[in-house]
């Protein structure tokens, strides 16, 4: 699966909107590496 | 509103550097990759590379790999791009970008800085 | 690094036209492919990620369609903002690269 930046982005994005946004504060493409999907 | 504001532009000679800044404002700056892309005269857009402001970890395209320098002053969320060795192929609009998620999911894009290499 | 080939480079069309721009990828991409318009002497403004899907705000005439190498964007009815010039961009693969952009003209 694709681990470039972008590609970490949109699925985090993804990822969020079909929690509703209830993830841990800390949860943003900048601290989540790949390994977190 | 998240906004990406570019230094002015720039003249240059051949074989000095540059220095670009992107000034981020409306989002937490520290959240996202910041990309800088590049745009000669009537040329393809070309990737320069990205970094994490977080952390300060990059990607460069190798066609820049020693000659491009990205760093971040996260304190005043800022980011940069420097040039090195600079020569007349390097006469370009070069932008800022960054992909945010909150509070809008958009691509925002700077203004552009254009740099012109000329003796 | 992976080659972006839009196709054609520019068209000419009319209001209220389809428009179907082309992007090959010369590898697979899966659907980690951009689009985006370009007026002159402005920044690249995004249009579509993810193949297709599109950000909000951009009017739902845009539709983008494609997976591995093969990409489309895709004017439903050509509105007179939207000549402009259009890149594809991939981001499966470091460096990222662009094809070098599709001008929509005035016929």
């Known amino acids: 699966s694709c681990n470039t930046a972008t590609c970490v982005t949109h699925r985090l994005a993804g990822l969020l909107s079909r929690s509703g946004g209830v993830v841990k504060d800390n949860f943003v493409p900048t601290n989540v590496g790949s390994e977190a999907f | 509103e998240v906004q990406l504001v570019q230094s002015g532009a720039e003249v240059k000679k051949p074989g000095a550097s540059v220095k670009v800044s992107c000034k981020a404002s409306?989002?937490?700056?520290?959240?996202?990759?910041m990309n800088w892309v590049r745009q000669a005269p009537g040329q393809c857009l070309e990737w320069i590379g990205d970094i994490n402001p977080n952390q300060g970890g990059t990607n460069y395209n190798q066609k820049f790999k020693g000659r491009a320098t990205l760093t971040v002053d996260k304190s005043a969320s800022t980011a940069y791009m420097e040039l090195s060795s600079l020569r007349s192929e390097d006469t370009a609009v070069y932008y800022c970008a960054s992909i945010i998620i909150v509070p809008n999911y958009f691509d925002y894009w700077g203004q552009g800085t254009t740099v012109t290499v000329s003796s | 690094d992976i080659q972006m080939t839009q196709s054609p480079s520019s068209l000419s069309a009319s209001v209220g036209d389809r428009v179907t721009i082309t992007c090959k990828a010369s590898q697979n991409v899966d659907t980690n492919v951009a689009w985006f318009q370009q007026k002159p002497g402005k920044a690249p403004k995004s249009l579509i990620y993810s193949a297709s899907y599109r950000y909000s705000g951009v009017p739902s005439r845009f539709s983008g369609s494609g997976s591995g190498t093969d990409f489309t964007l895709t004017i439903s009815s050509l509105q007179p903002e939207d000549f402009a010039t259009y890149y594809c961009q991939q981001y499966n693969n470091y460096p990222y690269t662009f094809g070098c952009g599709t001008k929509v003209e005035i016929k």
């Open positions: 409306g989002y937490t700056f520290t959240d996202y990759y």
